[in-house]
């Protein structure tokens, strides 16, 4: 009898009430593997969650977060509110970055500005709450007669994590 159940494919369940016949999963349920005795209830993306992928008979629904929130946890188990750039989310809510730190994301915490002098460079553009400092050539390179440095065109800024 166990062998009969193992023949039931994904999207079905082994129905004990019907001599272990493979029955399709009822609406709003799924089985992602074969040989299941029950189908699992589909996840519902409600409230701060929105549907990224609809439930099918063989796979669960996938949720994302509505605008103004971002996912946390495996399979987006939680939505956490965004802050503005130049802020960090503390346990008491969004708070401006302290002087000397920045956040160019809508999530995470404020990061210390780069210390250009550690790599023997000088500050070309001061940092703000939203942007890191831009380091230029070393002070020695800026002596009279040295060619002025043009910062490279920025590539995609770090921090754009795909969900």
């Amino acid at each position: 009898l166990q062998d009969l159940c193992s023949n039931c494919p994904a999207g079905t369940f082994c129905d004990n009430n019907r001599s272990q016949i493979c029955s399709p999963c009822p609406p709003n349920s799924f089985s992602s593997a074969g040989g299941q005795r029950t189908c699992d209830i589909c996840r519902q993306c409600k409230g701060v969650f929105k549907t990224r992928k609809e439930c099918s008979s063989t796979s669960n629904a996938e949720c994302d977060c509505i605008s103004g929130y971002h996912c946390l946890g495996a399979e987006c188990s939680m939505c956490e509110q965004d802050c503005k750039q130049g802020q960090e989310l503390t346990k008491k809510g969004c708070k401006d970055c302290c002087f000397g730190t920045f956040n160019d994301q809508k999530r995470g915490i404020c990061r210390p500005w780069t210390n250009c002098s550690l790599d023997g460079k000088s500050v070309l553009v001061n940092g703000t709450k939203e942007r890191d400092v831009v380091c230029g050539p070393s002070p020695a390179d800026l002596s009279p007669g040295a060619s002025s440095a043009t910062p490279p065109a920025p590539a995609r800024e770090p921090g754009h994590s795909p969900q």
């Epitope: 946390l72 960090e88 503390t90 346990k91 302290c98 730190t101 956040n103 994301q105 999530r107 995470g108 915490i109 404020c110 990061r111 210390p112 780069t114 210390n115 250009c116 550690l118 790599d119 890191d132 400092v133 831009v134 380091c135 920025p154 590539a155 995609r156 800024e157 770090p158 921090g159 754009h160 994590s161 795909p162």
Partner: antibody, heavy 120, light 110 residues
């Protein structure tokens, strides 16, 4: 899939320098900060610093300032960590690790580690 | 700089629940991350931002954080859970932004 592949083991004499590489694949290299963490034999994990692969901006733990230099070559999606004036207590496994896209979360992908042995 | 304190070891029988603590001043105001480290392997992130599991980490691993203590809980422990576990925070206000605890060796008895 995301992968960080580090250079092979090194044996160095005290006073020398070592440069460890970390080649990234499976994601946009310039889009994620890279960190370096080490573990000496029988000791815990120790954070060394980070580099922004986009701008080249760095931040080093105070303990390593003046001895460590983190660089990158975006054309080959590789980050480097150079440690100079090596001492015997720099013997450790050195790891590169990727930040997940914003500061304040855990380091989600790690290289396999590079053993650096400092011995006379 | 900020200090994180972990017990050197925690022992537990298979099938039981292991709790590993990480102490720090007002650590409840910070986001705590936990890594599993096995010999000759790279660390693996098992919990981030106090209580969230990355994909692929089993549900029996969980985290909490309040006051001066963060806790990593492993329920129904298995032999494969034997490893060192490290807590970690980011402390932007110090000269040492990345801070790790000293690590806790989880010993599975029997």
């Amino acid at each position: 899939q995301v992968q960080l592949v580090q250079s092979g083991a090194e044996v160095k004499k005290p006073g020398a320098s070592v440069k460890v590489s970390c080649k990234a694949s499976g994601y946009t290299f310039t889009g994620y900060y890279m960190h370096w963490v080490r573990q000496a034999p029988g000791q815990g994990l120790e954070w060394m610093g980070w580099i922004n692969p986009n701008s080249g901006g760095t931040n080093y733990a105070q303990k390593f300032q003046g001895r460590v230099t983190m660089t990158r070559d975006t054309s080959i999606s590789t980050a480097y960590m150079e440690l100079s004036r090596l001492r015997s207590d720099d013997t450790a496994v050195y790891y590169c690790a990727r930040e997940p896209g914003y500061y304040g979360s855990g380091l989600d992908y790690w290289g396999q580690g590079t053993l650096v042995t400092v011995s006379s | 700089s900020y200090v994180l304190t972990q017990p050197p070891s925690v022992s537990v029988a298979p099938g039981e629940t292991a709790r590993i603590t990480c102490g720090g001043d007002d650590i409840g105001d910070k986001r705590v991350h936990w890594y599993q480290k096995k010999p000759d392997q790279a660390p693996v992130l098992v919990v981030y931002e106090d209580r969230y599991r990355p994909s692929g980490i089993p549900e029996r691993i969980s985290g909490s954080n309040s006051g001066n203590t963060a806790t990593l809980t492993l329920s129904r422990v298995e032999a494969g859970d034997e490893a060192d576990y490290y807590c970690q925070v980011w402390d932007s206000s110090s000269d040492y932004p990345g801070v790790f605890g000293g690590g806790t060796q989880l010993i599975i008895l029997g």
